[in-house]
Amino acid sequence: SPYSSDTTPCCFAYIARPLPRAHIKEYFYTSGKCSNPAVVFVTRKNRQVCANPEKKWVREYINSLEMS
């Protein structure tokens, strides 16, 4: 999950596997102030998971979340 410093959440590691799409309810990008660019997926259990925005499955999920 993202590490919060001065209320700005940043990610220092990415999930290495696809999350079930049906378990994800929303997403947000971490701040440009963070050293690593990241997408944070929020699951239906309200867990926050850091993901690599360059991964194909991450881009696919973002597209489908934008359309829904």
Epitope: I15, A16, R17, P18, L19, P20, R21, A22, H23, T43, K45, R47, V49, K55, K56, W57, E60, Y61, S64
Partner: antibody, heavy 119, light 108 residues
Framework: QVQLVQSGAEVKKPGASVKVSCKVS????????MHWVRQAPGKGLEWMGG????????IYAQKFQGRVTMTEDTSTDTAYMELSSLRSEDTAVYYC????????????WGQGTTVTVSS | SYVLTQPPSVSVAPGQTARITCGGN??????VHWYQQKPGQAPVLVVY???DRPSGIPERFSGSNSGNTATLTISRVEAGDEADYYC???????????FGGGTKLTVL
């Protein structure tokens, strides 16, 4: 080094259940996803389901929904796959597989457990 | 659900190049993994994320993914490469891992 060691071969009658175990060494069970894949004689690989640690949930392939249960005993670092209402088509080699190394792909596999369903 | 199509068999002479294809609708939008399985053994990951190679896998194994086809290429084929090869992707529409039907590589 991550290793998965599975339980021995089983022979079951139609309608019975089978429970296959997969003992993990070299890492903690909850760290990575654990999947189960089966292979009928002379056929291809078929994903049955798996545990998603970040989500804390197990997902099952539609085909096996309601008939398969995957559990984990974190105290012994052992994963289990139980398949009920067995029929002859369930005769197969059952593998556990995990993804500790390369981007979600199944990089470590158990040796396989042969399950034979015969009356 | 998502379908991956592989040729049932591919034959190649030793020292030649083998190409095993995996077809799927817009497969280039997905990360493809490849496994090698020898008789009586568990599968072994040989390529992940389209074209990356796990440590210990020879450089002769490479992968590509474009359009509707992913390809596993084995250059300078050896007798020991004879095996079944399976492609795999994550299908987010069903939240299922999907395997291709497998390709039997025969070294002549």
């Amino acid at each position: 080094q991550v290793q998965l060691v599975q339980s021995g071969a089983e022979v079951k009658k139609p309608g019975a259940s089978v429970k296959v175990s997969c003992k993990v060494s070299g890492y903690t069970l909850t760290e990575f996803a654990m999947h189960w894949v089966r292979q009928a004689p002379g056929k291809g690989l078929e994903w049955m389901g798996g545990f998603v640690p970040e989500d804390g949930e197990t997902i099952y392939a539609q085909k096996f929904q309601g008939r398969v249960t995957m559990t984990e005993d974190t105290s012994t670092d052992t994963a289990y796959m139980e398949l009920s209402s067995l029929r002859s088509e369930d005769t197969a080699v059952y593998y556990c597989a995990t993804d500790p190394l390369y981007e979600g792909s199944f990089s470590v596999w158990g040796q396989g457990t042969t399950v034979t369903v015969s009356s | 659900s998502y379908v991956l199509t592989q040729p049932p068999s591919v034959s190649v002479a030793p020292g030649q190049t083998a190409r095993i294809t995996c077809g799927g609708n817009n497969i280039e939008s997905k990360s493809v993994h490849w496994y090698q399985q020898k008789p009586g053994q568990a599968p072994v990951l040989v390529v992940y994320d389209d074209s990356d190679r796990p440590s210990g896998i020879p450089e002769r194994f490479s992968g590509s993914n474009s359009g509707n086809t992913a390809t596993l290429t084995i250059s300078r084929v050896e007798a020991g490469d004879e095996a079944d090869y399976y492609c795999q992707v994550w299908d987010s529409n069903t939240d299922h891992w999907v395997f291709g039907g497998g390709t039997k590589l025969t070294v002549l």
